[in-house]
């Protein structure tokens, strides 16, 4: 089978600071030197691109300066971190991997990680 399998955790709970991390792992059918990783958010059948990065194998992932994502790669594994999350950002975050170079091109899409974000309770005012 020429398809590329992508694995990611089913559920992740964001920290109280609105940070969520998960691993996206792909079983590469080829010897790719250039890989593109995209995080998609699916909520209420709407799909939006959260962030995307292209990296050379062995190098760091480089997201755009204004991206809410950071990440590191190790072999066929990408460690993704999404920051600045709020309760309204709860949803299914899908890892999409593309082997860009050399040909042939391969596409792999994970089943998604449900990220739950709970806004922290505001600190009660003190009388002191």
């Amino acid at each position: 089978c020429k398809a590329m399998h992508v694995a990611q955790p089913a559920v992740v709970l964001a920290s109280s600071r609105g940070i969520a991390s998960f691993v996206c792992e792909y079983a590469s059918p080829g010897k790719a030197t250039e890989v593109r990783v995209t995080v998609l958010r699916q909520a209420d059948s709407q799909v939006t691109e959260v962030c995307a990065a292209t990296y050379m194998m062995g190098n760091e992932l480089t997201f755009l300066d204004d991206s809410i994502c950071t990440g590191t790669s190790s072999g066929n594994q990408v460690n993704l971190t999404i920051q600045g999350l709020r309760a309204m950002d709860t949803g299914l975050y899908i890892c999409k991997v593309e082997l860009m170079y050399p040909p042939p091109y391969y596409l792999g899409i994970g089943n998604g990680t449900q990220i739950y974000v709970i806004d922290p309770e505001p600190c009660p005012d003190s009388d002191f």
Epitope: C1, K2, A3, M4, H5, P29, E34, R36, T38, L40, V47, E49, A52, T54, K96, E98, M100, Y101, P103, P104, Y105, Y106, L107, I109
Partner: antibody, heavy 118, light 108 residues
Framework: QVQLVESGGGVVQPGRSLRLSCAAS????????MHWVRQAPGKGLEWVAV????????NYADSVKGRFTISRDNSKNTLYLQMNSLRVEDTAVYYC???????????WGQGTLVTVSS | EIVLTQSPGTLSLSPGERATLSCRAS???????LAWYQQKPGQAPRLLIY???SRATGIPDRFSGSGSGTDFTLTISRLEPEDFAVYYC?????????FGQGTKVEIK
């Protein structure tokens, strides 16, 4: 709304060149892969070429490799197909199409007819 | 290269009938990367189904897709007059991107 409009088709002699354009609107070109697909008269669909995101990665069908060049100008939201050394068998309607988030081809242009004949 | 073979070549049916179109791959294709398109004369193809079974935006629920591995099916539960067209399957999980040769659904 998303719209793709091809232009540049016409009648050309074998061995000559032609450049097709595809003007995209309603979305940001740099975030999508873009393909050219062709259809010979009365025949099925045949994939021709793709250019990815910033344009640095491209793939071609064996039938056009070395003769056709796909490119994009993201600042102009335009996709191109430079066709050199044209052959009679390149006669077809050429469609540009966008890759959706899942990899399928979700929007297509109306097509432009290229006829290679002596 | 993954070769997709569609059958039958032509399907002659009446409005209201059920249409079952088959697409067979020369090697296993992940169901995530199999699409179906509809094309009417003089028009560009239109995406109907992606991921083997997910309907594209605006596609009526009489269209459904199923299958896995090497065998995929497009079903039109009750043919409407506007459904008579040519249908293509496509794999998009790896290059080169390939299409089936098409199945023509014509009015009986």
């Amino acid at each position: 709304q998303v719209q793709l409009v091809e232009s540049g088709g016409g009648v050309v002699q074998p061995g000559r060149s032609l450049r097709l354009s595809c003007a995209a609107s309603g979305f940001t070109l740099s975030r999508y892969g873009m393909h050219w697909v062709r259809q010979a008269p009365g025949k099925g669909l045949e994939w021709v070429a793709v250019t990815w995101y910033d344009g640095s990665n491209k793939n071609y069908a064996d039938s056009v490799k070395g003769r056709f060049t796909i490119s994009r100008d993201n600042s102009k939201n335009t996709l191109y197909l430079q066709m050199n050394s044209l052959r009679v068998e390149d006669t077809a309607v050429y469609y540009c199409t966008r890759v959706d988030w899942w990899g399928a081809f979700d929007f297509w242009g109306q097509g432009t007819l290229v006829t290679v004949s002596s | 290269e993954i070769v997709l073979t569609q059958s039958p070549g032509t399907l002659s049916l009446s409005p209201g009938e059920r249409a079952t179109l088959s697409c067979r791959a020369s090697q296993s294709v992940s169901s995530s990367y199999l699409a179906w398109y509809q094309q009417k004369p003089g028009q560009a193809p239109r995406l109907l189904i992606y991921g083997a079974s997910s309907r594209a935006t605006g596609i009526p629920d009489r269209f459904s897709g199923s299958g896995s591995g090497t065998d995929f099916t497009l079903t039109i539960s009750r043919l409407e007059p506007e459904d008579f067209a040519v249908y293509y399957c496509q794999q998009y999980g790896s290059s080169p991107w390939t299409f089936g040769q098409g199945t023509k659904v014509e009015i009986k």
